[in-house]
């Protein structure tokens, strides 16, 4: 805590500028008016303050806004955002996507901190749902964002937002999450033709039921083995040898290399040996 002392003559800050770099901590406390700081927050980020100095500036803002900062200040926090605690952020009401983007920019290139997680949570709760623009923004900064949400949270994602999802955004999703996302994706892409539809739906197929896999097998999709290996075991087991052959097309030969791994292993054990032999891969049921 910086001791309260009178500002020396001639040192009262009239604007937030580079001269403040050379103010001692107590001078910043005594000579910088909190209201001036709030109106000129955009300048703070352009000045190379130490974090020790930023602590003093944060303290001044905290005194001015004990109930939480207004969005006009939050949007221009810049590096000062890194000094905020999750408790500070829980007091905020962030509604503008521009504000969210500005703060995520400070954190760019780094994994999600508790501060950022809290900020995103406040923002999404304020909006009531994960709309497309928000999801676009969040997955641009954090490709794994979607997979960090619980199935309950994912249920608030409208199907229209699924268009913003890229394959890499789903890399770390588990089957429970894909179970929620797949029906939304199916709805979102329902008006696309066969080959285009498959390209879009492919990343979500870890949540697909048996009947949808059967339908895909009739469309010459040539599913690759990596996608097949991510399918739900319970969805794969009822597929016939002929259906799997049609589903995989030329990739069917890859089954041999995966015969000891799920879901291939479990599927092989469910098939008649005569049917497996038709593949000519030497698979043993």
């Amino acid at each position: 805590e910086v001791e309260k002392t009178a500002c020396p003559s001639g040192k009262k800050a009239r604007e937030i500028d580079e001269s403040l770099i050379f103010y001692k901590k107590w001078e910043l406390e005594a000579c910088v008016d909190a209201a001036l700081l709030a109106t000129q927050m955009d300048r703070v980020n352009a000045i190379p303050f130490t974090y020790e100095q930023l602590d003093v500036l944060k303290h001044k803002l905290d005194e001015l806004y004990p109930q939480g900062y207004p969005e006009s200040v939050i949007q221009h926090l810049g590096y000062l955002f890194l000094k905020m605690s999750p408790e500070d952020i829980r007091k905020w009401n962030v509604t503008s996507l521009e504000t969210l983007k500005a703060l995520l920019e400070v954190n760019k290139g780094h994994e999600m901190s508790p501060q950022v997680a809290t900020l995103i949570d406040r923002f999404v709760k304020g909006r009531g749902q994960l709309d497309k623009d928000t999801l676009d923004t969040l997955t641009a900064f954090y490709p794994g964002y979607l997979c960090s949400l619980s199935p309950e949270e994912l249920s608030s994602v409208p199907p229209s937002s699924i268009w913003a999802v890229r394959p890499q955004d789903l890399d770390t999703c588990d089957p429970r999450q894909l179970d929620v996302l797949y029906p939304k994706a199916r709805l979102a892409f329902q008006n696309m033709n066969g080959s285009e539809y498959f390209v879009k739906i492919q990343s979500f197929l870890g949540g697909a039921p048996t009947e949808d896999l059967k339908a895909l097998s009739q469309q010459n999709v040539s599913m690759d083995l990596a996608t097949f290996m991510k399918l739900r075991t319970d969805a794969v087991l009822p597929l016939t040898v002929a259906e799997v052959q049609k589903l995989l097309g030329p990739h069917v030969e890859g089954l041999k290399a995966e015969e000891r791994h799920r879901p291939v292993r479990d599927w092989i054990l469910r098939q008649r040996q005569d049917d497996l032999d038709t593949l000519g891969l030497g698979l043993q049921g």
Epitope: P48, T50, Y51, Y79, K83, G109, H110, E111, P114
Partner: nanobody, 126 residues
Framework: QVQLVESGGGVVQPGRSLRLSCAAS????????MHWVRQAPGKERESVAT????????YYADSVKGRFTISRDNSKNTLYLQMNSLRAEDTAVYYC???????????????????WGQGTLVTVSS
Amino acid sequence: QVQLVESGGGVVQPGRSLRLSCAASGSISKFRSMHWVRQAPGKERESVATIDLGANTYYYADSVKGRFTISRDNSKNTLYLQMNSLRAEDTAVYYCAAAPKWYSDPGQSDDLHDYWGQGTLVTVSS
């Protein structure tokens, strides 16, 4: 954890020059800004020169303007302070400080802070 080590201090006569160095244990590209800060006996620390590494701009306290020059060598991960026309009032322990762009370790979520060296003593005396 980044370490900063200052060197180059010593006893010098008024009007003479000294060059201080601050070697960082890791890449200085991790920092937003680097600073030379001094503390005279019985006084509070004061910043004398700052470099904004992103914007590549330099700032000086009025008391040293025109006499001190801050610079850095990225390839050596070293910050320098060239001090000319030294005066008795420049006597102090000189510290190097650095403000990181972000937490030094992935996943670190404790308080973000500046890194400081242990200081090097500069005595200006006839």
